[in-house]
């Protein structure tokens, strides 16, 4: 019972975590304009992995996608890759874990196979969570570096009276969503791995029984059957197909630029 609960809870936690990783990846607010010196701005800049946006004091929001692949910083590409790998692994892990759930009966699937699948999905969730945490941390590190660099050259003089004020960026909401989601996926994965141990049937040691037949004395020793704990090879050799995780387009509503009545 405890095993089923642990497995089920691990699945739910991982599901929430992966949903969070997907949400964070799609969010525009990975970095937001630092408002420390000026809490009220006429133009508020924020950036995501896929596009950068401006929210004007007029209420309008305009976003511009990064339509270049080669022109983007390598770090941004790396963060994108880590987040996508995290999502893909998480999605596959979810698919595997659905079939591994003890409360779901699929044909005559043995507990050993379920244990194997639970462990596989657990490992996938752990790697997925680590990818998300790594991705978000790399981006956060990039922000911190840029923040101090732009603070150092906050005002660069141009011909005396003209000055260019660099927009400084700080942590956006997506970073916190990503960290929490990655952590949840990681915890869910660990729970799945713990549940796997409980799912695997323990080694049953039967006492040797001697049968004395007339004539020859033959002792039958039913050897202790060792169940696959999931660390060995999958005897069933089942193929797991990824149904292809698709995320819906970002749902964000902006005020219409032509809001006439």
């Amino acid at each position: 019972m405890a095993v089923t609960a642990c497995q089920g809870l691990g699945f739910v936690v991982s599901l929430i975590g992966i949903a969070g990783i997907i949400a964070a990846t799609c969010m525009d607010q990975w970095s937001t304009q630092d408002l420390y010196n000026n809490p009220v701005t006429a133009v508020f800049n924020y950036q995501g992995l896929w596009r950068s946006c401006v929210r004007e004091s007029s209420g309008f929001t305009e976003c511009r996608g990064y339509f270049t692949l080669l022109g983007l910083p390598a770090m941004l590409q790396a963060v994108r890759a880590l987040m996508i790998v995290g999502i893909v692994l998480g999605a596959i892990g979810l698919l595997v874990s659905i079939f591994a759930l003890k409360c779901i009966r699929i044909g005559s699937m043995e507990d050993s196979a379920k244990a194997n699948m639970t462990l596989t999905s657990g490992i996938m969730f752990i790697v997925s969570g680590l990818c998300a945490i790594a991705g978000v941390s790399v981006f956060a590190n990039m922000l911190v570096t840029n923040f101090w660099m732009s603070t150092a050259n906050m005002y660069t003089g141009m011909g005396g009276m003209v000055q260019t004020v660099q927009t400084r960026y700080t942590f956006g909401a997506a970073l916190f969503v990503g960290w929490v989601a990655g952590g949840l996926t990681l915890i869910g994965g660990v729970m799945m791995c713990i549940a796997c141990r409980g799912l695997a049937p323990e080694e049953t040691n039967y006492k040797a029984v001697s049968y004395h037949a007339s004539g020859h004395s033959v002792a039958y020793k039913p050897g202790g059957f060792k169940a696959s704990t999931g660390f060995g090879s999958n005897t069933k050799n089942k193929k797991i197909y990824d149904g292809g995780a698709r995320t819906e387009d970002e749902v964000q509503s902006y005020p219409s630029k032509h809001d006439y009545v």
């Epitope: 133009v43 800049n45 401006v54």
Partner: antibody, heavy 118, light 113 residues
Framework: QVQLVQSGAEVKKPGASVKVSCKAS????????VNWVRQAPGQGLEWMGM????????RLNQQFKDKATLTVDTSTSTVYMELSSLRSEDTAVYYC???????????WGQGTLVTVSS | DIVMTQSPDSLAVSLGERATINCLSS????????????LTWYQQKPGQPPKLLIY???TRDSGVPDRFTGSGSGVDFTLTISSVQAEDVAVYYC?????????FGQGTKLEIK
């Protein structure tokens, strides 16, 4: 069509107060900020502040924080600007204008001339 | 506050000629998020309220004749009237829409020679 209609000209004594109104029509009133801009005789334009009709949130030019108070009456789609402690320097044409994309002012009222004279 | 400086203060142009008005900002008006310049141009005729001509430095407002063109980026902006008409006689203002308080240039008076 979009229209901003302002109240008529006012003549006030120094130290008095005046309340200028700006009635909006032809668009969704609560979706757009309304600005106030003043123009002294023969002078340029000066931004005073703006108000959002939905939550009466305001942004005031620090220069006018003790001079102007912006309020809204959503039931009549009207924005008000009250000017206090009037002085002769406050003699100007006061315009209300709707804020458009790019923080530009796309529709303007016809202007209200406030004359401060003893 | 951002200071907007227009040049020249007044301009006399013959009908059909090109008129150029410059506007210099004390600070960049370019927003990094959408790569747009928050500069607006207005036309004000005597006894009338200002009229929006161009926003985002180069986007013409609806109904504005295409002889009016806005250009520039960062701190240096230009309003060009390709072929001046009699009805273009007015004072032209540039405005910072990038940061509070919104500020206007001192204005450029366009007259017919």
């Amino acid at each position: 069509q979009v229209q901003l209609v302002q109240s008529g000209a006012e003549v006030k004594k120094p130290g008095a107060s005046v309340k200028v109104s700006c009635k909006a029509s032809g668009y969704s009133f609560t979706n757009y900020w309304v600005n106030w801009v003043r123009q002294a005789p023969g002078q340029g334009l000066e931004w005073m502040g703006m108000v959002h009709p939905s939550g009466s949130e305001t942004r005031l030019n620090q220069q006018f924080k003790d001079k102007a108070t912006l309020t809204v009456d959503t039931s009549t789609s009207t924005v008000y600007m009250e000017l206090s402690s009037l002085r002769s320097e406050d003699t100007a044409v006061y315009y209300c204008a709707r804020v458009w994309s790019g923080n530009a002012f796309d529709y303007w009222g016809q202007g209200t001339l406030v004359t401060v004279s003893s | 506050d951002i200071v907007m400086t227009q040049s020249p203060d007044s301009l006399a142009v013959s009908l059909g000629e090109r008129a150029t008005i410059n506007c210099l900002s004390s600070q960049s008006l370019l927003a990094s998020g959408n790569q747009r310049n928050y500069l607006t141009w207005y036309q004000q005729k005597p006894g009338q309220p200002p009229k929006l001509l161009i926003y985002w430095a180069s986007t013409r407002d609806s109904g504005v004749p295409d002889r009016f063109t806005g250009s520039g980026s960062g701190v240096d902006f230009t309003l060009t009237i390709s072929s001046v008409q009699a009805e273009d006689v007015a004072v032209y203002y540039c405005q910072n829409g990038f940061s509070f308080p919104f500020t206007f240039g001192q204005g450029t008076k366009l007259e017919i020679k």
